[in-house]
């Protein structure tokens, strides 16, 4: 015997006060799938959060952060305050990055900073609070008779003090 | 006796305005979620619009902007304020006491109403 619950579609629910019949989901509910006996209440996007998809009878809301905030977790289920470049959110609110380490994102934390002596190499450009540091060539690369980025200064003959 | 009973209705013009009552016995309207609904000739049922018990209102969109529901918890009486009336308005409109699940103010699911009106007749005509 088919359940006769299972005719009613998305948008409605199985009626059980009412002999099965399929009732349209009121406002403020959903129901996204057929032959639900219940609809589902709707999301609210409240305080910080903000309705990026309305309610329809057969999808849930959805919501995104108000600027200054971004989202974390399955369907933006929370808000965290955006930060600055440089900086992390601490317990204590948005905190620069301490010496040695970036942050380029307005989230996130700080990381640390490339050690470029791990492969073997020299540090181009410096590193900041926002930037990791930049990796040149490796030491090897510059000594005389190898190739370079920059030629080796031609060496001053002995005898000759500078003019 | 739990029991609802509306009172409002009548033969209106378009673009006029009505306000039904739905007078409640046997239990508290403000600590319920209260809905009104309406039928048109020869069509199903139709959610109007809802009130939850922390006074949190909802509407379908066919009425959003010209009803308004409220209650007065003195009186025990649910509302329905419909202005700019059109002839897709006519009805006949009950009120009706919802069953939600979840606790308190925070409703999670809607499974029905338990608790209906007699109805009253709204005709909107010129």
């Known amino acids: 015997l088919q359940d006769p619950c299972s005719n009613c579609p998305a948008g409605t629910f199985c009626d059980n006060n009412r002999n099965q019949i399929c009732s349209p989901c009121p406002p403020n509910s959903f129901s996204s799938a057929g032959g639900q006996r219940t609809c589902d209440i709707c999301r609210q996007c409240k305080g910080v959060f903000r309705t990026r998809k309305e309610c329809s009878s057969t999808s849930n809301a959805e919501c995104d952060c108000t600027p200054g905030f971004h989202c974390l977790g399955a369907g933006c289920s929370m808000c965290e305050q955006d930060c600055k470049q440089g900086q992390e959110l601490t317990k204590k609110g948005c905190k620069d990055c301490c010496f040695g380490t970036f942050n380029d994102q307005k989230r996130g934390i700080c990381r640390p900073w490339t050690n470029c002596s791990l492969d073997g190499k020299s540090v181009l450009v410096n590193g900041t609070k926002e930037r990791d540091v930049v990796c040149g060539p490796s030491p090897a690369d510059l000594s005389p008779g190898a190739s370079s980025v920059t030629p080796p200064a031609p060496a001053r003959e002995p005898g000759h003090s500078p003019q | 006796e739990v029991q609802l009973v509306e009172t409002g209705g009548g033969l209106i013009q378009p673009g006029g305005s009505l306000r039904l009552s739905c007078a409640a016995s046997g239990f508290t309207v403000s600590s319920n979620y209260m809905s009104w609904v309406r039928q048109a000739p020869g069509k199903g049922l139709e959610w109007v619009s809802v009130?939850?018990?922390?006074?949190?209102?909802y509407y379908a969109d066919s009425v959003k902007g010209r009803f308004t529901i409220s209650r007065d918890n003195s009186k025990n009486t649910l509302y329905l304020q419909m202005n700019s009336l059109r002839a897709e308005d006519t009805a006949v409109y009950y009120c009706?006491?919802?069953?939600?699940?979840?606790?308190?103010?925070?409703?999670?699911?809607?499974?029905?109403?338990?608790?209906r009106g007699q109805g009253t007749t709204v005709t909107v005509s010129s």
């Open positions: 009130i939850y018990s922390d006074g949190s209102t």
């Open positions: 009706a006491r919802d069953r939600y699940y979840g606790s308190g103010n925070y409703p999670t699911a809607y499974y029905g109403m338990d608790v």
